[in-house]
Amino acid sequence: DFGLDCDEHSTESRCCRYPLTVDFEAFGWDWIIAPKRYKANYCSGECEFVFLQKYPHTHLVHQANPRGSAGPCCTPTKMSPINMLYFNGKEQIIYGKIPAMVVDRCGCS
Amino acid sequence: DFGLDCDEHSTESRCCRYPLTVDFEAFGWDWIIAPKRYKANYCSGECEFVFLQKYPHTHLVHQANPRGSAGPCCTPTKMSPINMLYFNGKEQIIYGKIPAMVVDRCGCS
């Protein structure tokens, strides 16, 4: 199970993981105490048939070709959490692990 | 965490799970001994901003709007395995649980 890694200089057109730093301060999300920014990454690129398909199911749907199935798209296939310190709606400070905040791998599904 | 369920008569344009029976016999995939067909389902539809977003990350990438990020697409967000009986490449009969063969829920990611 692998995925491509690219950067802003890459000429890769296929599904790839790109670096992206999310800056909560720039968004004006000041209820987030820490971190103020983190490396989130994102997925972008084309999904040619079979390339980086995460699931056998993706191939089977392509084979069956039902009405309205758009073909696979480049999406996170492995994600990881980050620890965050933030205010909840009741203005209590919460420290917790927030799931699926970082893209570790991209694939076609 | 929920997703929409549709059928061939639905007028829903948003991201939805549709029924699909995969027929291995019709594909000529005779190395699969059993099942000969199974209910796989598939995802199709539009991902308007925030609708059925699986991860907070999806929202953050939209907010950061990096070059080449295409916006979320309708993709499986929950999948389940099926048991299969099949011949491997060495012509041995294998009985095993094959992961991610059935779409249980669709969402935007």
């Epitope: - | 291995f24 016999e25 005779d30 059993a34 000969k36 099926i82 048991n83 009986l85 011949f87 009985y95």
Partner: antibody, heavy 124, light 107 residues
């Protein structure tokens, strides 16, 4: 509909060989195991073996292993059972039967269709 | 090889009777047991699979039960067309083995 049609009756001398055919129709021949079962006159049923037409993988009853060969012709959807070195106690009706899986476990199947049987008489 | 012992070997009964045929395996066969009906000069016909499941198209007067080593076939109300020979088969292990048969005759 699913059908198995077997070749006609044979009379053979001891020591000879016989090749019984079983022509399948109404389904994808290559994707289902074919079994062979025999029945001596007035006796019970005896399993001889099976073959998977897609790849020709076969499994024989040890009792017959040295004398039996199961083959298929995918182009005509026909299964064959050849028995060599015939003896008088090989006189029997030979049946082919399709193995149908109702589930996915290795033993989750039953015989859903049988051929009409082929009588093989071994006599000097 | 797994031995399948069927009893009785023959049975006389009348139309309308309820009859039971038993099959005992020499070891646990995990309910992988089928029952067949055979009429003279004809191929066997599958009735029951996995010990108690009825094959499509088989009338519900036929029923199967049992687990482990002991299994039974019951015909609830005999009709003239039910007089035949019945066989059990274990498919838990190769080689597959049949019971020796039970001949059901009209009294």
């Amino acid at each position: 509909q699913v059908q198995l049609v077997q070749s006609g009756a044979e009379v053979k001398k001891p020591g000879a060989s016989v090749k019984v055919s079983c022509k399948a129709s109404g389904y994808s021949f290559t994707g289902y195991f074919m079994h062979w079962v025999r029945q001596a006159p007035g006796q019970g049923l005896e399993w001889m073996g099976n073959i998977y037409p897609y790849n020709g993988v076969s499994n024989y009853n040890q009792r017959f292993k040295a004398r039996v060969t199961m083959t298929v012709d995918k182009s005509t959807s026909t299964a064959y059972m050849e028995l060599r070195s015939l003896r008088s106690d090989d006189t029997a009706v030979y049946y082919c039967a399709r193995r149908y899986y109702y589930g996915t476990g290795p033993a989750d199947w039953y015989y859903d269709v049988w051929g009409q049987g082929t009588l093989v008489t071994v006599s000097s | 090889d797994i031995q399948m012992t069927q009893s009785p070997s023959s049975l006389s009964a009348s139309v309308g009777d309820r009859v039971t045929i038993t099959c005992k395996a020499s070891q646990d066969i995990n309910s992988y047991l089928s029952w067949f009906q055979q009429k003279p000069g004809k191929a066997p016909k599958s009735l029951i699979y996995r010990a108690n499941r009825l094959v499509d198209g088989v009338p519900s007067k036929f029923s199967g039960s049992g687990s482990g080593q002991d299994y039974t076939l019951t015909i609830s109300s005999l009709q003239p067309e039910d007089f035949a020979t019945y066989y059990c088969l274990q498919s838990d292990e190769f080689p597959l083995t049949f019971g020796q048969g039970t001949k059901l005759e009209i009294k």
